[in-house]
Amino acid sequence: SIPWNLERITPPRYRADEYQPPDGGSLVEVYLLDTSIQSDHREIEGRVMVTDFENVPEEDGTRFHRQASKCDSHGTHLAGVVSGRDAGVAKGASMRSLRVLNCQGKGTVSGTLIGLEFIRKSQLVQPVGPLVVLLPLAGGYSRVLNAACQRLARAGVVLVTAAGNFRDDACLYSPASAPEVITVGATNAQDQPVTLGTLGTNFGRCVDLFAPGEDIIGASSDCSTCFVSQSGTSQAAAHVAGIAAMMLSAEPELTLAELRQRLIHFSAKDVINEAWFPEDQRVLTPNLVAALPPSTHGAGWQLFCRTVWSAHSGPTRMATAIARCAPDEELLSCSSFSRSGKRRGERMEAQGGKLVCRAHNAFGGEGVYAIARCCLLPQANCSVHTAPPAEASMGTRVHCHQQGHVLTGCSSHWEVEDLGTHKPPVLRPRGQPNQCVGHREASIHASCCHAPGLECKVKEHGIPAPQGQVTVACEEGWTLTGCSALPGTSHVLGAYAVDNTCVVRSRDVSTTGSTSEEAVTAVAICCRSRHLAQASQELQ
Amino acid sequence: QEDEDGDYEELVLALRSEEDGLAEAPEHGTTATFHRCAKDPWRLPGTYVVVLKEETHLSQSERTARRLQAQAARRGYLTKILHVFHGLLPGFLVKMSGDLLELALKLPHVDYIEEDSSVFAQ
C-alpha cells in the first residue's frame, strides 16, 4: 500500500492503491547538496547524475572508518524521497548530486557556498529548464550563506531547505533563515511536529510550511535494493522539493514567488497540533502541511496571498519591526501585534522603491511584530493614502479616491503611548467600503490598489467586550488581503491574517478586571480578481 | 611539505605584486564588519570568507586577496587563498590567523568577513 507520507501529500482525486500523480517533474532538474550517494541503487539508478563536485571537511576522530554505505546513507535516502521509482515524490525528476557533507554528515559554510557557486556556473554554461536546489543541511545563522542563497534565488533557482532538527527557532539557523529559500519543518503521520530524541523540528516565522518527516521510507545505501525509514527536516524538505519539481514541470514559467504562494495555498491548513511549539512561537509558525495541487493547471485565476511576520522589534521604544514582501509580491496590507498590548500601531511606507510594513513599539519592553499581507497581483498599481490624526472629530478616516482603485488594507499609527486612555472609541460608518476609519489621535493609512478586474469588500465581526480573540473569514472564492481591528484601544493586542481568516487578539476583560463597554471588531478586506478568473477560463 | 611550498610560492607572488603597485589605496567610508557563528562548537576559526562589495570584479577580488597576503607577510604571517568566489558573491576564502582580521577588514572593497562554520545533515 502507499506509504503514509505519499498519501499525505496526495490530493484525494489521485488517491488509489498507488501514488501516481500526473507528470513526475520530468522538465525539472533537482540539485542535491548532501553526502555522497549510491547512484546505482534501483530507486534512483539513471535518475541521479553524480557531479564531480566535492568539498567536505575531514571526518572527526583519528580512528574513523570510512564505510561506503554509511557515507552515502543520508544523500541516497533523500534522492530516493525526491525522485525514487517506488517511494519518490517526483518520479520523473532528474537529479544532480554535489558532495558537501562528509561521512559523518558534516560540512562547512564555505563548502556549501562553493557548491552553490558551482550550480550557478553550471546554469550559466548550460541553461536547462527550471532548477530546484535541495539543501538538507543546517548550521548557525550565516550572513554569507543567506546572501548566496538570495543571489541564486534571484537568478531564478528555487531553493528548498530543512528547517533544522534543533527544536528551536529556525531563524537562528542557515540557510533556513534566508527569506528567499523555502524552509520546511517536519510533521509525522499524526500531523504532530516531529520529535527527534530530545529535540525535534524547528519552528517559527522562518518556516514556510511543514511536510512529512518521520518514518519516511526511502532508498537505503546498505544494498542496491534496500529500503530504510529515516526522519528529519531533510526528509520533509525532500518532499517539498519533489512537489516543487512537479509544479514546475506542469508550469515551467512559475516564479519563485508564485511557487511559494501555491505551495502555501494547496497545503493542508490547521492540522498541526500547535501545543507542541513554545507558546510565543505558535502565532508565528505556519500551520501548513505541504500537498500537491488537486490539478496541475488552473490555479492561475486565484488571488494568492500569504502572511509574513517580521522579527521581534526588541525591547526599547526606539526599536521598530519591519515585515517585507518578496520582490514580485505586492504589500496589500500591514498590521501589528504585541503580546503586552503596548504598541503604537503600524504603517506602510516606501523603502528602496518598495512598500514595507513597519510596526512601532511602545514602552514596557515587550516589543512588537509587524505583519505584512503579501499577494501576487499582476499589473497592480498600489499606493498608500494617509490621513493625519483628526484630533477634534469623532475619528480619523481616509479613503481611496483615485478612479478604479480599491481598498485592500487599513493601518493606523499613533504617537500617544496608550490610546485606551484617550476616548471616545470610533464607530464605523456603514456603507463606505473604500474607507479606513480609526481613532481620532491616530494617523490612518489606506492601501489602495488598481489592478485589472480587482474587486474587494469589507467584512466585519464585532463582539461586545474584549474576549481574547475575534475572527472574521473571507468566503470561498475571495482572498483575505487586509486585517485590522476597531477600535485601536489598549485592549487590542493586534491583528493578523491566518490563511483566509482575520484574527484580532485582545486582552480578556475577565483577567484585566475592566468593565469596558467597548466592542472589539475584526475587519477583513476580502478581494478577488475577475480578470485572473476570466483569463483562466479562456485558457480552458 | 607540499602545502608549505605552495604557501611560500603564493607569498612570494603576493609580495612581488605589492611592489609592482597592483594594490589600490583603501577606501574610506563604512567599516566592514566581522561575523561569526553564535554557536561556539560550530565555529571554524582560521578559515574566513571575505565578502567584497556587490559590484566587485573577479580581477579586483584576486587583487584584494593578494594584497591581504602581502600585508600579512610583512607582519610575518602565512596565509593561503583557498578559493576565489565569483558568479554568486564576489570574495575569497582564506586560511589565516585571526590576528589578521583587523587588517583584512580595512582592505578595499571588503563588505564583511565571516568566520567559517560547520553545517550538518538534518
Epitope: 522589534s313 526588541g314 525591547p315 526599547t316 521604544r317 526606539m318 514596557g364 516589543g367 504617537e415 503611548e417 | -
Partner: antibody, heavy 117, light 110 residues
Framework: EVQLLESGGGLVQPGGSLRLSCAAS????????MSWVRQAPGKGLEWVST????????YYADSVKGRFTISRDNSKNTLYLQMNSLRAEDTAVYYC??????????WGQGTLVTVSS | QSVLTQPPSVSAAPGQKVTISCSGS????????VSWYQQLPGTAPKLLIY???KRPSGIPDRFSGSNSGTSATLGITGLQTGDEADYYC???????????FGGGTKLTVL
C-alpha cells in the same frame, strides 16, 4: 518624582563577582523596561543589558553575554545586575536607566565598579 | 569602535549654531528611532531628543533632531556656555539585537 538609586559597586578582583542593585521609585516600576548602561573612565556610553517590564524578555551586549544576568523584582521595585567572571575591561560607572530612548527615559547617578588585582 | 560614528569634537562661539552628526547603517539608524543625550561633566546622561526629532518636556527648542537615511543630526542654536558637554546619539540595532551608542562628541563653547 522619578528616582533611580544604584548600589553594589566597588573593587573586585578579576574573575570575581558582584551584584548591582537599582532601587526605583516615583513610577509604576513593572510597566517599564529597565536597562544597565556603563561608562568606562574617560570613555563613551556602552549598553550592557535590558529587561522588559514583566521580566519575560532579556537582552545582553555580546561583551557580557554568559557572564552577566539582568533581573528584576517588581514587588520590591528593584532592578539587579549579577556580574560574574569580571574582567579589567568591565571597570566602569554602571548606570541604571528607565525606558532608554523614550519620553520616559531617566537615568540614575551611577555606581562605580573597579576590577583590578 | 562604536557602531554609530560621531565626530570626536565640535566647537562654536556663544549664540552660534552647531550640528553634530551621527552615522550608522540600515540595521540601526536606517530602520529605528534615534535618541540624543547630553552628559554634563560628572553627571548622568540626560535625554534631549527621542523618536528622531521630539523633545521631552523641559528641553528647550534650541535643541532639534533630524534624520535622513542612515544618518542623524543634532542641532543646537543660540549656544550657551552651559551647553558644554558630551553628546551621544543612540538607537536600537536590529541585527545586533542591542542598544548602540555613538562614541560621543565633545562640544566646546568658545
Amino acid at each position: 518624582e522619578v528616582q533611580l538609586l544604584e548600589s553594589g559597586g566597588g573593587l573586585v578582583q578579576p574573575g570575581g563577582s558582584l551584584r548591582l542593585s537599582c532601587a526605583a521609585s516615583g513610577f509604576t516600576f513593572s510597566s517599564y523596561a529597565m536597562s544597565w548602561v556603563r561608562q568606562a573612565p574617560g570613555k563613551g556610553l556602552e549598553w550592557v543589558s535590558t529587561i522588559s517590564g514583566s521580566g519575560g524578555r532579556t537582552y545582553y551586549a555580546d561583551s557580557v553575554k554568559g557572564r552577566f544576568t539582568i533581573s528584576r523584582d517588581n514587588s520590591k521595585n528593584t532592578l539587579y545586575l549579577q556580574m560574574n567572571s569580571l574582567r579589567a575591561e568591565d571597570t566602569a560607572v554602571y548606570y541604571c536607566a528607565k525606558e532608554v530612548g523614550s519620553p520616559f527615559d531617566y537615568w540614575g547617578q551611577g555606581t562605580l565598579v573597579t576590577v583590578s588585582s | 569602535q562604536s557602531v554609530l560614528t560621531q565626530p570626536p569634537s565640535v566647537s562654536a562661539a556663544p549664540g552660534q549654531k552647531v550640528t553634530i552628526s551621527c552615522s550608522g547603517s540600515n540595521s540601526n539608524i536606517g530602520n529605528n528611532y534615534v535618541s540624543w543625550y547630553q552628559q554634563l561633566p560628572g553627571t548622568a546622561p540626560k535625554l534631549l531628543i527621542y523618536d528622531n526629532n521630539k523633545r521631552p518636556s523641559g528641553i528647550p527648542d534650541r535643541f532639534s533632531g533630524s534624520n535622513s537615511g542612515t544618518s542623524a543630526t543634532l542641532g543646537i542654536t543660540g549656544l550657551q556656555t552651559g551647553d558644554e558637554a558630551d553628546y551621544y546619539c543612540g538607537t536600537w540595532d536590529s541585527s545586533l539585537s542591542a542598544v548602540v551608542f555613538g562614541g560621543g562628541t565633545k562640544l566646546t563653547v568658545l
